[in-house]
Structures are given as C-alpha cells and as structure tokens.
Amino acid sequence: IWELKKDVYVVELDWYPDAPGEMVVLTCDTPEEDGITWTLDQSSEVLGSGKTLTIQVKEFGDAGQYTCHKGGEVLSHSLLLLHKKEDGIWSTDILKDQKEPKNKTFLRCEAKNYSGRFTCWWLTTISTDLTFSVKSSRGSSDPQGVTCGAATLSAERVRGDNKEYEYSVECQEDSACPAAEESLPIEVMVDAVHKLKYENYTSSFFIRDIIKPDPPKNLQLKPLKNSRQVEVSWEYPDTWSTPHSYFSLTFCVQVQGKSKREKKDRVFTDKTSATVICRKNASISVRAQDRYYSSSWSEWASVPCS
Amino acid sequence: RAVPGGSSPAWTQCQQLSQKLCTLAWSAHPLVGHMDLREEGDEETTNDVPHIQCGDGCDPQGLRDNSQFCLQRIHQGLIFYEKLLGSDIFTGEPSLLPDSPVAQLHASLLGLSQLLQPEGHHWETQQIPSLSPSQPWQRLLLRFKILRSLQAFVAVAARVFAHGAATLSP
C-alpha cells in the first residue's frame, strides 16, 4: 500500500481467482483513543472499533472511503483504491491503446517547436467518475523539472456504438534549452482513477522526436505571365522556434488534382517559395518539417489553383 | 577553418557539409527509432558521449558572443563519432558495403572535422570506449543506437553552421 495523495491510498493486488489479497491496517488520524468506530462509504454498518482497523482487501467491494467516527463526529477519512496486477502485468483498462506508433501506446505527445512545451493526449471510452493527474520530468535518476497543467477533456468522438473521449495536457520544461542536443528523455507519468480503480501510464521521449510543426502560413499563389506556372509562397508558422536561420524548416509542395487517383506532383525545397504548374481544378498544398532532423511533417496548408 | 587564435571557420562550406551529414545519418538508419530510451547501464558505467549541452555556446546568442566554445564542442563530437564509425562496431561483422551511407558518413565526419581544425592545432578529444562487444548482433544493436545519437548531434551542428553562414559569415 502507498499514499497517492493526502488520505488516498493505493492497494496493489495480484488479481486472480481466490487470490488472498492484501492485509491493510488503517489508522484513525486523531489523538482520541476510545470510542472510535469505522464505516465504509455511505453505509452505517460498523466495520470495527478502535484507533486501527485491519481489513483484508481482495476486491473492489473492499475498496472505498473508510471513515472513523466518534460519537457521531467524523474524525478522518482514508480512501482506498485498487491497482490490479493480472498475470504479472498492471491493468490498462481505463485508457485505449492508440496502437501508433506501436502497440501499447496509451499516451501520445507532440511539440510544435523546441521551446520545451509539449502536449500529450490519451483516449478513453469512460465518461464519468474519472480523474487524471500528470507529472513529468527530464530524466528519472536526477530529474529536472517539467510543469504540467491539469488534464482536460479536449474532444469527443463517436466510434461505431461507442463514444470516445480525448483528454489532453500541456507541459512546459522549467529550464528548457532549445539549442541543446537532448541526452536525457522527458518522462511523462499519468495517474488515472476510475471509481475505485487506479492505473498509471508512462511515456518517455526526446522533444526532437515528437516535433510536429504547425502548417506553413500565408500560402499564396502568384501567376507567372504567359505561363501555366505559378509562384507559390508561404511563411514559417508563428509557433515555430526562432531565429529561422538557426531553427530551419524544409518544405514539401504538392499539386493535387480533384481526383485522389490523379498523379501528385511533389517538390521539396528549403526556400519559402516554389514554382509549379497549376492544373485546372487542382489544389496546391505545402507542409513543413525540421530541416535537419526527420521528425513528423506538419499537416498540409492548401489553396485552390483557380 | 577555425584556427588557433579564434578566426572564423568557412561557415558556408561547413553548412553544406553538415547538412549532407544530416541526410547521410538518416539514410544510414532511416527508422525513427522506438528503441528503449533509458540508457541505464549498471553501477560502474559512465556515459562518455560528447553532447552539445546548454552551456556550450551553440545557441544563436552564444555563437554571436564567441563561436569558438561551440566549434570546439562540435569538433570533439565529430572526432568521437568519426572514430566510432571506423571502429570494429561498424567494421566488424555484419559487414557494410564500401559505398554504404555509413562509409560516406564516416568520410564526411572526417571532412567536416578537418574544415574546423587545420593540421598542427589540436583540441582535446574524447576517447572512444575500449570494451567492445564480441557478437555481430550486439554490434548491430549498437550501430542503431549510435546512429540515432549521431542524428541528434549532427542536427544541432547543422543548425549552428546554417545560422553562422546566414549571420556570421564575413
């Protein structure tokens, strides 16, 4: 058993039929010695008396809020949560496996630049009685600070018969050094509690590997005289690290016909303009990627050819 | 060339070669790795890999103030990786083709380090490890890990030279 936060405890249980469970001793936080009784949740049934209560925790019915009282007055509470270990593996019932970039990916994170700010998100089909708490650090043995906000519900989607809920959190490295070569990964730890079930999820990454720039901005076309060619120009996204002479992007320009089957023409350039042939009903799209490190491409920014 | 006394390197040449290094490093090991990131060895092990750290003056402001600290650090890393790519980790079994991206990478690391430091002037360099694995599959695993680290190192070096070429070239 260990303390998650004040008056909230996690009991780790090997979860199999007829498992013996864990013996837990609860102590009432009071100077009182006599006349103390214990109850569980909203029940008025007295479970025991005395300053300590010994219970055998085997299943979710044994978890919950234990309260010690004296003469009708509440003295203190202890909330017991269960963390299930099935066949040697901690349960992952609360979050959905996103399966990208590999199986058992429950947390996904992205950064728009090298400032040390990043966003992580996760999915669940659970809609109520759900809380998350996020901690992060750079490195684990001598951790350096990363501050995370509160996790918030960021999207709801319908997937077949199920509703899927996306939660996200923003974190910021306290003393970020955008120009340095990372040698220690960022660690992200999410505590998830659904009713009386506790689970934890972790992710480990370098900022450089989760970079995904915003799409290029101000995408414009300038027809060239007496030609089917146009000059496409764009700018670095506002969210990208500066100066751009240091934090450079490379770009992919694509001409795409109305039909997905039509051949796509692609040009790669380090400049913020390119000359392409604009076909009727086609559109021109541009996306960006770090010039020197092959992390993710941005989403496309597009304009119609007409 | 960065000569003793601190004159400027050939920023544009360095920019071109460092950008080529980035391309080669990714063609040598194209996977964006999902290797285990925690490189925790056992009790007595030390991490000897030269990283470009926060205090090395490789940020835009540091380069403007005095680029020598940063160039020295980059040179140290280039020599370290050049020696690694020439070591039995890469020359042993399983063999690489003579014109493989790793061979080109090795030559380009040497080329860039020579651009930064002319003959006769020596910055201190890091020793490469002596305890070498005996098995081909151990070497293969280390090659992946070394190339992943090299990708990160040359990316920072390329940013430095791009910025230098744009803002510090005479």
Partner: antibody, heavy 127, light 108 residues
Framework: QVELVQSGAEVKKPGSSVKVSCKAS????????ISWVRQAPGQGLEWMGI????????YYAQKFQGRVTITADESTSTAYMELSSLRSEDTAVYYC????????????????????WGQGTLVTVSS | DIVLTQSPATLSLSPGERATLSCRAS???????LAWYQQKPGQAPRLLIY???RRATGVPARFSGSGSGTDFTLTISSLEPEDFATYYC?????????FGQGTKVEIK
C-alpha cells in the same frame, strides 16, 4: 524489482516439441534480453540462444540451430523457448536468464553474462 | 568451441579458509568476456563476477576474480557457510558461449 517466472515442469515423448515460457514482471521488458540455458541432471550449463530484443533477431547456438525457436511477446512481457524433435538427452532443467547490461560509450547493450535467472523448468523426455 | 576446464573438480575446505578456483580456456579469452557463477542445489545460478574481475551487484567483497588470456581465478578470501556450492566459469568471447564443468566447494 524484475522477476523471471517460468512455466511448470513438462513430460514429453521423444520426437515431440516443448514450449517453455518466461514472464518478466516489473521493469521494462523491451530493454531486457532473455537467453535460454539448460542443465542436464548432474551436469554443467549449456547456452542455447537469446530472444530478440528491439532491432535484433533471435540468435542460437549452432548445436540447437533448426531445432530451437526463441520468441518474445512484448505485450505480455513473456519470452518463449520451443525445442522440437525431442530426444532423451534433452531431459534437463531449462532456465531463462536476463543479460546483464554492458555500456559502450553511452549506449547499453546486452552482455552474454546473466544477472537474473528464472526458477527453471524441468523437461523430461521419456517414452 | 572454446573449452573451459575448471580445477579442482572438488575443493574440501573449512569455513574461514581461503578458496582458489581455477578456470583454464582452450584458447585465449579477452578478460572482458569471462564470468563466474555460483549455484546451490535446486537453485538457479547466480552471477558473481563479470569482465573477469568486476563484482556483480550485491556480491560480497570476499569474492574476487583475476586473470587474463587462458588462465582465470576466482578467490573466496574467507569462506562463509553460505559459500559452499558449485562454481562455474563462462566465456562469452566466441559462440557458443561455453561454461566450465564446475568446481564443487564442500565443507571439510
């Protein structure tokens, strides 16, 4: 704390196959490399092969090549060793063992020395 | 294959005495690639020494390893009751990674 827990004893007929499992609990399975070592009754130790980690294929001792298959399932943190065409001289205790991590510069790699062992699985081959 | 020959096959000593176990290789083994294990009846082996002379985590200081090339030694400076067991050397220089046949340290 990582622990390696192996499947129970097996009695097999000559010519058949046996599949022994080894479950790692605690720690990061993907960074652990599991070898298989056997010990015939009253005899010494014999290395059979190593299960694939990230980026490597299974690697076998020549003696067992073609008869042994070593696999790993990262999702269940379990390594498996399957030995086919069993004969009486395959009667032994089969151990899974984790490679100690060596360091080359700043990069870890598995040494072929074993710092954590399963409890062993006795496989008896008898007609 | 590299053959490792351990001697003596059995060593009879009393608690408090010094034990010297030998492991000889049929061809040169880099000292980076030699390990020693302890095994008690009914138990799995336990790594004691790796890289010929480095003690594994939690191994008492009375165990020490030395040697290079073809001759390696495991020394137990003062035998404790729990040290009576069989000891194996192992080379990882060449495949197959071979073990010696073992030295049994028994109470005299």
């Amino acid at each position: 704390q990582v622990e390696l827990v192996q499947s129970g004893a097996e009695v097999k007929k000559p010519g058949s196959s046996v599949k022994v499992s080894c479950k790692a609990s605690g720690g990061t399975f993907s960074s652990n490399y599991i070898s298989w070592v056997r010990q015939a009754p009253g005899q010494g130790l014999e290395w059979m092969g190593i299960s694939p980690g990230t980026g490597i294929n299974a690697y076998y001792a020549q003696k067992f090549q073609g008869r042994v298959t070593i696999t790993a399932d990262e999702s269940t943190s379990t390594a498996y060793m399957e030995l086919s065409s069993l004969r009486s001289e395959d009667t032994a205790v089969y151990y899974c063992a984790r490679s100690k991590k060596g360091m080359y510069g700043g990069w870890t790699y598995p040494l072929m020395m074993f710092d954590l062992w399963g409890q062993g699985t006795l496989v008896t081959v008898s007609s | 294959d590299i053959v490792l020959t351990q001697s003596p096959a059995t060593l009879s000593l009393s608690p408090g005495e010094r034990a010297t176990l030998s492991c000889r290789a049929s061809q040169s083994v880099s000292s980076n690639y030699l390990a020693w294990y302890q095994q008690k009846p009914g138990q799995a082996p336990r790594l004691l020494i790796y890289y010929a002379s480095r003690r594994a985590t939690g191994v008492p200081a009375r165990f020490s390893g030395s040697g290079s090339g073809t001759d390696f030694t495991l020394t137990i400076s003062s035998l404790e009751p729990e040290d009576f067991a069989t000891y194996y050397c192992q080379q990882t220089s060449n495949t197959p990674f071979t073990f010696g046949q073992g030295t049994k340290v028994e109470i005299k």
